[in-house]
């Protein structure tokens, strides 16, 4: 199971597998999540301890039972690895730490105007892992505005010091935000030179590449296949780095495969897990458990559910089987990779999927023809549920927004389909920020079914809600994940932190925007809204939002998009952009379909279509 709670003033005793310095408990938790053996962690903030050496200490821990005794320690923070937590698993860490200097090897210094610019430089430098920036008020004038790019052997700071007017942070390469771009090619019969940073056993070059991608210092790799001439080196995956960031030389070599880390890819990174099953292969390692199961897929599921299991072998030897079930050997090792790989066996092997992002758990618990007027540019991954509904007739254009609410479901406004009810003219783009990034090669979803509310009537404002079932389910990523739906009981809830997003017009007679816009808008009571729209009926199934003075609003092209509010610590889809008198006019709020009022309808339609709810509502 996924355990997310943090324990304040608590420290786990014993079980240490690694320690490092991290700026906060969340980063410590992320390092625990990606460490092959870490199940629990304890973190000591600067305020919690006088011992300078232990300040910002992050202690990664393992336990055979899955738990350790907790001792009281004022200020300490402890918690669990997020292995098995599906979409909450991410190596991306965007926070900037003020008043903190993260130490490491300083390999590049430059003058920049802001900490954001420094972080961007780090993200665009192949070797940079973290950075420090001296602000304009730093005590030594010659260091002001200095941006120091850094790395360390373990990818984490070698020390962290409290220092005024310094701001630090990490590269956003794990957020798939690097501008460097990556080499997807795999080079057969080629070996790279340079420094080996680690050596693991893998069944193929693709697993080797994923391990390289998530290793803090691996920039490229060479894999020796199972027919490599030296038996002891078969299936060896050498993780490598170099001063320049690229291999200084490569040698043609039979039965070797080389390639690059994919950490510098833009927009998408490989999942930090290996889902392929390898028939006729045995993985050796420390025995965790042996169980009888029916089929190799069940064996993999069993391994995934047992949090300490890293890989498995399903044996089809007659002596290992009874009736339809055979032995499933659950195993682990120090580095998460098999200690031995044997071919030509009667087994099938594979890895735990505990670090895969595609679990069924509710991911919406995780983070944030009507354009936004008075808004600002959004950033990557800020509103990962936002989709663009586009129509391809002679040309292709953005018409409406929508919200991803499940792997195969988008919620939008019914009026988006007025006059365009044919599902095959629509293309749905998810996980995008800039419309200009869409090319003929950009993947899109097609519509399997459009479900318009049965009481919706064209050119009326009521029941302006529609569901789209996609032809194929979407995988969730940092940039593409669903928004939580409200409960039916939220019909009278008061929300105070609400945002509208979209690519719509920036003024009434404007044009579609390139970058997704966001605007913070207060909700308006229905009574107040009704006063502003005396010619229309504002029903309890609508919600209004806007400033009395105008200036900020949704506009044409934002229709169908989300009005989301952060409530009790979670983002919820409160409204669907529907209609309004002009855009951002004084005392003319925007009108949105109230999602809580349609929860019965949404769940009825999504369940009857699938047999079970596919939404990422909080359940």
């Amino acid at each position: 199971g996924c355990l997310t709670q943090l324990y304040e003033n608590a420290f786990f005793r014993g079980g240490d597998v690694a320690s490092m310095y991290t700026p906060n408990a969340q980063y410590c938790q992320m390092r625990c999540t990606f460490h092959p053996r870490c199940l629990l962690f304890s973190f000591l903030p600067a305020s919690s301890i006088n011992d300078m050496e232990k300040r910002f200490g992050c202690f990664l821990k393992d336990s055979v039972t899955g738990t350790l005794p907790k001792v009281h320690r004022t200020g300490a923070v402890s918690g669990h690895s997020l292995k098995q937590c599906g979409h909450q698993i991410s190596a991306c860490h965007r926070d900037i730490y003020k008043g903190v200097d993260m130490r490491g090897v300083n390999f590049n210094v430059s003058k920049v105007s802001s900490v954001e610019e420094c972080q961007k430089r780090c993200t665009s430098n192949i070797r940079c892992q973290f950075f420090s920036y001296a602000t304009q008020t730093f005590h030594k004038a010659e260091y002001r505005n200095n941006c120091l790019l850094k790395y360390s052997p373990g990818g984490t700071p070698t020390a962290i010091k409290v220092l005024s007017n310094v701001e630090s942070g990490f590269s956003l390469k794990p957020c798939a935000l690097s501008e460097i771009g990556c080499h997807m090619n795999i080079f057969q019969h080629l070996a790279f030179s340079d420094v080996d940073v680690a050596r693991v056993l893998t069944p193929d070059a693709f697993v080797c590449r994923t391990i390289c991608t998530y290793h803090p210092n691996c920039l490229f790799f060479t894999f020796y296949t199972n027919v490599w001439k030296i038996e002891s080196q078969r299936n060896v995956c050498l993780l490598k780095t170099s001063e320049s960031g690229t291999p200084s030389s490569s040698t043609p070599q039979e039965n070797t495969i080389s390639g690059y880390s994919l950490l510098t890819c833009k927009r998408t990174l490989p999942e930090p897990c290996h889902s392929k099953i390898y028939p006729g292969v045995d993985f050796g390692g420390e025995e965790l458990n042996v169980t009888f199961v029916k089929g190799v897929n069940v064996c993999q599921e069993t391994c995934t559910k047992m949090i300490r299991c890293q890989f498995f072998t399903y044996s089809l030897l007659p002596e290992d089987c009874k009736e339809e079930k055979c032995k499933c050997f659950l195993r682990l090792s120090m580095d998460g990779s098999p200690t031995r790989i044997a071919y030509g066996t009667q087994g099938s092997s594979g890895y735990s999927l505990r670090l895969c992002n595609t679990g069924d758990n509710s991911v919406c618990t995780t983070k944030t023809s009507t354009r936004i007027v008075g808004g600002t540019n959004s950033s990557w991954g800020e509103w990962p549920w936002q989709v663009s509904l586009q129509v391809k007739l002679t040309a292709q254009r953005h018409l409406c927004g929508g919200s991803l609410i499940g792997h195969q479901w988008v919620l939008t406004a019914a009026h988006c389909f007025d006059g365009l009810p044919l599902q095959d003219v629509w293309r749905i783009y998810s996980g995008i920020l800039n419309l200009s990034d869409i090319t003929k090669d950009t993947p899109f979803s097609q519509i399997k079914e459009i479900i318009i509310h049965q009481n919706y009537k064209v050119s009326e404002g009521n029941h302006d809600i529609a569901l789209i079932k996609l032809q194929a389910p979407l995988n969730y990523t940092e940039f593409q994940k669903p928004i939580c739906l409200p409960s039916k009981g939220d019909t009278s809830t008061i929300y105070t932190n609400c945002w509208v997003t979209g690519w719509g017009f920036s003024k009434e007679k404007g044009e579609i925007q390139n970058i997704l816009q966001k605007v913070n808008i207060p909700l308006v009571t229905n009574e107040e809204c009704q006063k502003r729209y005396q010619d229309y009926k504002i029903t309890q199934r609508m919600v209004c939002a806007g400033y009395k003075e105008g200036g900020k609003d949704a506009c044409k092209g934002d229709s169908g998009g989300p009005l989301v509010c952060k409530h009790n610590g979670m983002w919820r889809l409160v409204g669907i952009t529907s209609w309004g008198e002009g855009c951002a006019r004084r005392e003319q709020p925007g009108v949105y379909t109230k999602v809580a009022e349609y929860m019965d309808w949404i769940l009825e339609k999504t369940q009857s279509s699938d047999g079970k709810a596919q939404m990422q509502s909080p359940a």
């Epitope: 304040e8 409960s487 769940l603």
Partner: antibody
Framework: QVQLVQSGSELKKPGASVKVSCKAS????????MHWVRQPPGKGLEWIGA????????AYNQKFKGRVTITADESTSTAYMELSSLRSEDTAVYYC??????????WGQGTLVTVSS | DIQMTQSSSSFSGSLGDRVTITCKAS??????LAWYQQKPGNAPRLLMS???GLEAGFHLRFSGSGSGKDYTLSIASLQTEDVATYYC?????????FGGGTKLEIK
């Protein structure tokens, strides 16, 4: 860490009113609702109502409507639940509870209110 | 109001037993359900919910399942520290309502 500390036990006569307080710390008081739940001795839990301190918005269980008032003081990060026209069946432990999402993730220690003549 | 019914108000099991506590809603609550554990003299403690899964500090022997109107809380292997009263609560429709509770004891 999140802490909810409630006021002490109360002994009240039938027909009187009681006001129970709940002081919150360890989080931004205005960002989360505060709910009130009661538990008569040896019995189950019953939801009374809630307030959103950031907006002042309230929601009540109709069963208590007219008798209960939930308020919040932003300056002291304290929520209050006042129950009037007390009767013997109002004898219970009254809890404040803060949600994460919908479920009540954090609870006060409880305040025993005894109604007796 | 949605009624939540926990069929047995008490249950006695042996150490190591698999225990199942049931909760039935008077209408479909679409998995919007939380379970709480309450030990004598203490406030209830959130055990698990559709919103957050199993809460930290609880052993993985606890699991929840169900859909529609019917939900169950299972304990794979009953331990002495599991002795408590367990309540279900729906958060689909206000007023939020709780089940009557199931008191779990060791034989």
């Amino acid at each position: 860490q999140v802490q909810l500390v409630q006021s002490g036990s109360e002994l009240k006569k039938p027909g009187a009113s009681v006001k129970v307080s709940c002081k919150a710390s360890g989080y931004t008081f205005t960002d989360y609702e505060m709910h009130w739940v009661r538990q008569p001795p040896g019995k189950g839990l019953e939801w009374i109502g809630a307030i959103h301190p950031g907006s002042g918005g309230t929601a009540y269980n109709q069963k208590f409507k007219g008798r209960v008032t939930i308020t919040a003081d932003e300056s002291t990060s304290t929520a209050y639940m006042e129950l009037s026209s007390l009767r013997s069946e109002d004898t219970a432990v009254y809890y404040c509870a803060r949600p994460y999402g919908y479920p009540f993730a954090y609870w006060g220690q409880g305040t025993l209110v005894t109604v007796s003549s | 109001d949605i009624q939540m019914t926990q069929s047995s108000s008490s249950f006695s099991g042996s150490l190591g037993d698999r225990v199942t506590i049931t909760c039935k809603a008077s209408e479909d609550i679409y998995n919007r359900l939380a379970w709480y554990q309450q030990k004598p003299g203490n406030a209830p403690r959130l055990l698990m919910s559709g919103e957050t899964g199993l809460e930290a500090g609880f052993h993985l022997r606890f699991s929840g399942s169900g859909s529609g109107k019917d939900y169950t809380l299972s304990i794979a292997s009953l331990q002495t520290e599991d002795v408590a009263t367990y309540y279900c609560q729906q958060y689909w429709s206000t007023p939020w309502t709780f089940g009557g509770g199931t008191k779990l004891e060791i034989k």
